[in-house]
């Protein structure tokens, strides 16, 4: 939601004033701001909080691991890509306390909200990886035992990486600074000018590439770990199952509304009642889907003391061995009840 | 390229309005505003309202009470209507982007001369 | 309102002399949130619309010549043309975009 027939994360629109008050200048902003961009900031600023904290936590606990522990590869490059999104935080609270004013400067407004949306889809891209090699571990243990090594799984993020940039691409490409109203405010936004199709294109292919693929791919993975893992009474059940609840529901309660919101906004009138109503939410959506950034720690620390009762053990520690044990055993031919356990664990990431 | 076409009647009767239509080519009304300006036979330029790309409005307070603007989006239309014409009403009005820094009309429509007479 | 004041209202120059032309606010364009002065001025010929030659009070518009040169800040603005060609002879109107739209009276340019 980034252009500005729909104003977003970033710049807002303003209240029709057509009665003026000659005395002062006619600013369209009123001086206090909507709810839904109070909830978003008190939203922002504890994802903030939370979000470089733990995630720089977990990057600080998997980087030491990173070269001999598959796991630890995943969870560096989801915290390193959380981490980044939370940096752009103040940028964005900074805008929106100011009424949607962008003070930052014409290369900040190309760079910045792309960089935030770069490590939003990494984050997805991310996520689907690491349930595509809980898939493998289940099912393909032969072949992870072959195959599965450091070398592939950093190509695999790489992809995921590659992928999220060629997502943020038209973001970049078509992001500029303009002033409007009075006094004049400089708002950032990406600027589709003629273009409808292309600016519906784009909306298409980030719900598709950014909420439904990594939502179908992660439905249908844990439906079958699930299926395996109760069939062959590896792990206690109803752990595993709030665990991938969790997992599912998270990811699709926090990026739903930004993208069913992208995706009307691409496709109605601007003028229409339905848009002005979610030009206001946008924010607030924006915000939500920004939980994402903070919850993977959060997750990893409550699956550490749940599954292990690690309660007094101290948070580094606590992670390490939440992030950084092996999943495949050295046989060949079945999973441990720890290997399973561990690896319920690591899906909570998702 | 940027173009602004301007249409609407040359010749208005006294207490009649006036209606303009600014069709844009080249950029899209939902980035950018529209500004409505005169200019009278030998006068300078006088500012009139404008239309925002999100559809607000803001307009000069001698005008504020007969003049309307209004836009539609999907067919690149910007619309002027100011009613209660009188003789000194007369001038050439233009219509103009608002270019997207500095709040200045970067692109200008070629010019509506409207001469009010019966 | 801000009330535009331009000054001289006319000016007679000869080809390649250097130009002045003054534009005073009755209240500062400084935008504190911006930090932009909100003046522009715009070149006008007989029977053309009229052309955007400077915003920000001194930035000049793509593919306006460099011999047109805006400055000043809050409320004094001046207009430079470094050496007039006779394809400068026009009206200058300087305009604010602070607090609504005010255009000055305009300075016409002609021939000596």
């Known amino acids: 939601m980034d252009s500005f027939n729909y104003t977003t994360p970033d710049y807002g629109h303003y209240d029709d004033k057509d009665t003026l008050d000659l005395n002062t200048p006619v600013d369209k902003t009123s001086n206090t701001l909507r709810v839904p961009d109070i909830l978003a900031l008190v939203i922002f600023a504890v994802v903030f909080l939370v979000g470089v904290l733990g995630n720089a936590l977990v990057v600080w606990v998997t980087a030491f691991e990173a070269k001999r522990t598959i796991n630890a590869i995943w969870f560096l490059n989801l915290a390193v890509a959380d981490f980044l999104s939370c940096l752009a935080l103040p940028i964005l609270f900074t805008s929106i306390v100011q009424h949607h004013h962008w003070p930052f400067g014409g290369a900040a407004c190309s760079i910045l909200p792309s960089l935030i949306l770069l490590n939003m889809y990494a984050s997805i891209l991310l996520l689907a990886t690491i349930s595509a090699d809980r898939f493998l571990l289940v099912f393909k243990p032969i072949w992870c035992q072959n195959f599965r090594g450091a070398g592939l799984a950093w190509i695999a993020c790489a992809v995921a990486w590659g992928l999220a940039l060629l997502l943020t691409i038209p973001s970049f490409l078509y992001r500029v600074v303009r002033e409007e109203y009075f006094p004049p405010k400089v708002l950032c936004g990406v600027d589709y000018s003629h273009d409808k199709r292309r600016e519906r294109a784009v909306a298409i292919v980030r719900l598709v590439l950014g909420f439904l693929w990594p939502l179908l791919t992660l439905t249908i993975c844990y439906t079958f770990i699930l299926l395996r893992t109760w069939s062959r009474r590896a792990t206690r059940s109803t752990k595993t199952l709030k665990v991938v609840v969790a997992v599912v529901a998270s990811f699709f309660i926090f990026w739903l509304p930004y993208q069913v919101t992208g995706i009307m906004m691409s496709f109605l009138e601007p003028s229409s009642p339905t848009f002005l109503l979610l030009k206001k939410l946008d924010s607030l959506c924006v915000s939500f889907a920004y939980i994402n950034c903070c919850i993977n720690p959060i997750i990893y620390v409550v699956a550490g003391q749940g599954f292990q009762g690690r309660l007094r053990k101290s948070l580094p520690s606590l992670l390490r061995n939440v992030l950084t044990e092996e999943s495949v055993v050295r046989e060949s031919k079945s999973f441990t009840r720890s290997t399973v356990d561990t690896m319920a664990q690591k899906t909570q990431a998702v | 390229q940027v173009q602004l076409k301007q249409s609407g009647p040359g010749l208005v009767q006294p207490s009649q309005s006036l209606s303009i239509t600014c069709t844009v080519s080249g950029f899209s009304l939902t980035s950018y505003g529209v500004h409505w300006v005169r200019q009278s036979p030998g006068k300078g330029l006088e500012w009139l309202g404008v239309?925002?790309?999100?559809?607000?409005?803001d307009y000069n307070a001698a005008f504020i009470s007969r003049l309307s603007i209004s836009k539609d989006n999907s067919k690149s239309q910007v619309f002027f209507k100011m009613n209660s014409l009188q003789a000194d009403d007369t001038a050439i009005y233009y219509c103009?982007?608002?270019?997207?820094?500095?709040?200045?009309?970067?692109?200008w429509g070629q010019g509506t001369s409207v001469t009010v007479s019966s | 309102d801000i009330v535009m004041s331009q000054s001289p209202s006319s000016l007679a120059v000869s080809a390649g002399e250097k130009v002045t032309m003054s534009c005073k606010s009755s209240?500062?364009?400084?935008?504190?949130?911006?930090?932009?002065?909100?003046l522009a001025w715009y070149q006008q010929k007989p029977g053309q619309s009229p052309k955007l030659l400077i915003y920000?009070?001194?930035t000049r518009e793509s593919g306006v010549p460099d011999r047109f040169t805006g400055s000043g800040s809050g409320t004094d603005f001046t207009l430079t043309i470094s050496s007039v060609q006779t394809e400068d002879l026009a009206v200058y109107y300087c305009k604010q975009s602070y607090n609504l739209l005010t255009f000055g009276a305009g300075t016409t340019l002609e021939l000596k």
């Open positions: 103009a982007r608002n270019g997207l820094l500095g709040n200045a009309m970067d692109y």
């Open positions: 920000w009070a001194s």
């Open positions: 209240q500062s364009l400084l935008s504190s949130r911006t930090r932009k002065n909100y």
């Open positions: 239309i925002w790309s999100g559809g607000s409005t």
